[in-house]
């Protein structure tokens, strides 16, 4: 039904999340999410994942720098809010963003391998 | 925040169960009561896959397994013998069980540790 997530996905506040235990590059992560009819995590706010705020892993999220727009964009084309990551101005624009649910973000080489989080909105 | 599904608001769903992911630290007995008051049970671990998942969510939490003393067997909340290995069981002071990053270990029941609750759908 419309309120259920796929098996092995976490349901929270009308969203479904796949939290990987495998490490992949950012591009591999993006494709794996797409293959499951979802996208790499787009955060609405820093407490979106507060159910796993004790986690000490970093996860690839769906944020990349657009040279065309000279801005950090989510996969759906919307711009990163400056309030989400206060340190975003120091991020290397050639890198991808690894996020920890505690609110920390790091810019790292997109070829590095990290876990990743896919997100699907239920409604 | 919007609310969907079959679990209480602010709980998560995973593999046909609802989980309350606590941030408060309680003794084992306080955790048991807190979960009861939420019409659920202190976290139970049914399989290795669930243990892995919960270890990603939180590094350590009470589970609903205890023993009356080190001479007694480990039992679940419904009184059944608990079959999985619990580390440090030789220590007589440690009679309540904790999930700690992909393994189960014994702990002092009076320690303040994060707790999670669960109920099956």
């Amino acid at each position: 039904d419309c309120c259920s997530c796929q098996e092995k996905w976490v349901g929270y506040r009308c969203n479904c999340y796949f939290i990987s235990s495998e490490q992949k590059t950012w591009n591999e992560s993006r494709h794996l999410c797409a293959s499951q009819k979802s996208s790499l995590l787009q955060l609405q706010n820093t407490d979106e994942l507060d159910f796993m705020s004790s986690s000490q892993q970093f996860y690839w999220i769906g944020l990349s720098y657009s040279e065309e727009h000279t801005a950090w964009l989510w996969e759906n084309g919307s711009a990163l809010s400056q309030y989400l990551f206060p340190s975003f101005e120091t991020f290397n624009t050639k890198n991808c963003i690894a996020y920890n649910p505690n609110g920390n973000a790091l810019d790292e080489s997109c070829e590095d391998k990290n876990r990743y989080i896919c997100k699907q909105q239920l409604i | 925040a919007r609310h969907c599904g079959h679990c209480p608001e602010e709980w998560i769903t995973y593999s046909n169960s609802c989980y309350y992911i606590g941030k408060e630290r309680r003794t084992w007995e306080e955790s048991l009561l807190a979960c009861t008051s939420k019409n659920s049970s202190l976290l139970s671990i049914d399989n290795e896959e669930e243990m892995k998942f919960l270890s990603i969510i939180s590094p350590s939490s009470w589970i609903g397994v205890f023993r009356n003393s080190s001479h007694h067997p480990w039992v679940t909340m419904n009184g059944l013998a608990f079959k999985h290995e619990i580390k440090d069981s030789d220590n007589a002071e440690l009679n309540c069980a904790v999930l700690q990053v992909n393994r189960l270990k014994s702990a002092q029941c009076g320690s303040s540790i994060i707790y999670h609750c669960k109920h099956k759908l």
Epitope: S54, Q56, N102, N104, S109, E111, D112, K113 | P59, V101
Partner: antibody
Framework: EVQLLESGGDLVQPGGSLRLSCAAS????????MHWVRQAPGKGLEWVST????????YYADSVKGRFTLSRDNSKNTLYLQMNSLRAEDTAVYYC?????????????WGQGTLVTVSS | DIQMTQTPSSVSASVGDRVTITCRAS??????LAWYQQKPGKAPKLLIY???SLQSGVPSRFSGSGSGTDFTLTISSLQPEDFATYYC?????????FGQGTKLEIK
């Protein structure tokens, strides 16, 4: 069994260079970030540098930034620390350490250390 | 940078004693804290990570607690092999930083 074996420590003059190596075995090297931590004689521990699992990203302590370069060769299971413009205050035992599987900021296995002495 | 302050800097105790070492972070680090033991001439050894998780193979007499800025390492009943120097370390953000160490000596 995890093993980390450092080499390359030596006596070097101020302004000189040195390359430390750390040979790793007993675990899947390219799954883990790696670190260098140092300890000056009779002093405490100081984090020096971290490299991610694929080697794409490196982090450095301010005290070594611009002088030290951390790299890895995953095909050889080896970590390298290139140290240039060495100073007396770089004198220390240098340990290479493996990142913990739970979170990379913890050091779960350490080598035996290699001594770097910077003196004229 | 996050400063880590350990107290006491040294402590004398006897075999069988219960010993507590504390570590304070200059800002909140949630549970991103580790404890290490180091013996003279040897590499450090990880005891506790994520503030309270016992590293595999470490005896259960070692325990860690705390969250935020204040953390504790407790040795419930000292054994002869426990006399060493203990360090806390924050893993919340770069640069990773250690406490100055606590030397545990035989009384």
């Amino acid at each position: 069994e995890v093993q980390l074996l450092e080499s390359g420590g030596d006596l070097v003059q101020p302004g000189g260079s040195l390359r430390l190596s750390c040979a790793a075995s007993g675990f899947t090297f390219d799954n883990y970030a790696m670190h260098w931590v140092r300890q000056a004689p009779g002093k405490g521990l100081e984090w020096v540098s971290t490299i991610t699992n694929s080697g794409g990203t490196t982090y450095y302590a301010d005290s070594v930034k611009g002088r030290f370069t951390l790299s890895r060769d995953n095909s050889k299971n080896t970590l390298y620390l290139q140290m240039n413009s060495l100073r007396a205050e770089d004198t220390a035992v240098y340990y290479c350490a493996k990142a913990h599987y739970y979170a990379r900021g913890y050091f779960d296995f350490w080598g035996q250390g290699t001594l770097v002495t910077v003196s004229s | 940078d996050i400063q880590m302050t350990q107290t006491p800097s040294s402590v004398s105790a006897s075999v069988g004693d219960r010993v507590t070492i504390t570590c304070r972070a200059s800002q909140g680090i949630s549970s991103w804290l580790a404890w290490y033991q180091q013996k003279p001439g040897k590499a450090p050894k990880l005891l506790i990570y994520a503030a309270s998780s016992l590293q595999s193979g470490v005896p259960s007499r070692f325990s860690g607690s705390g969250s935020g800025t204040d953390f504790t390492l407790t040795i419930s009943s000292l054994q002869p092999e426990d006399f060493a120097t203990y360090y806390c370390q924050q893993a919340n953000s770069f640069p990773y930083t250690f406490g100055q160490g606590t030397k545990l000596e035989i009384k």
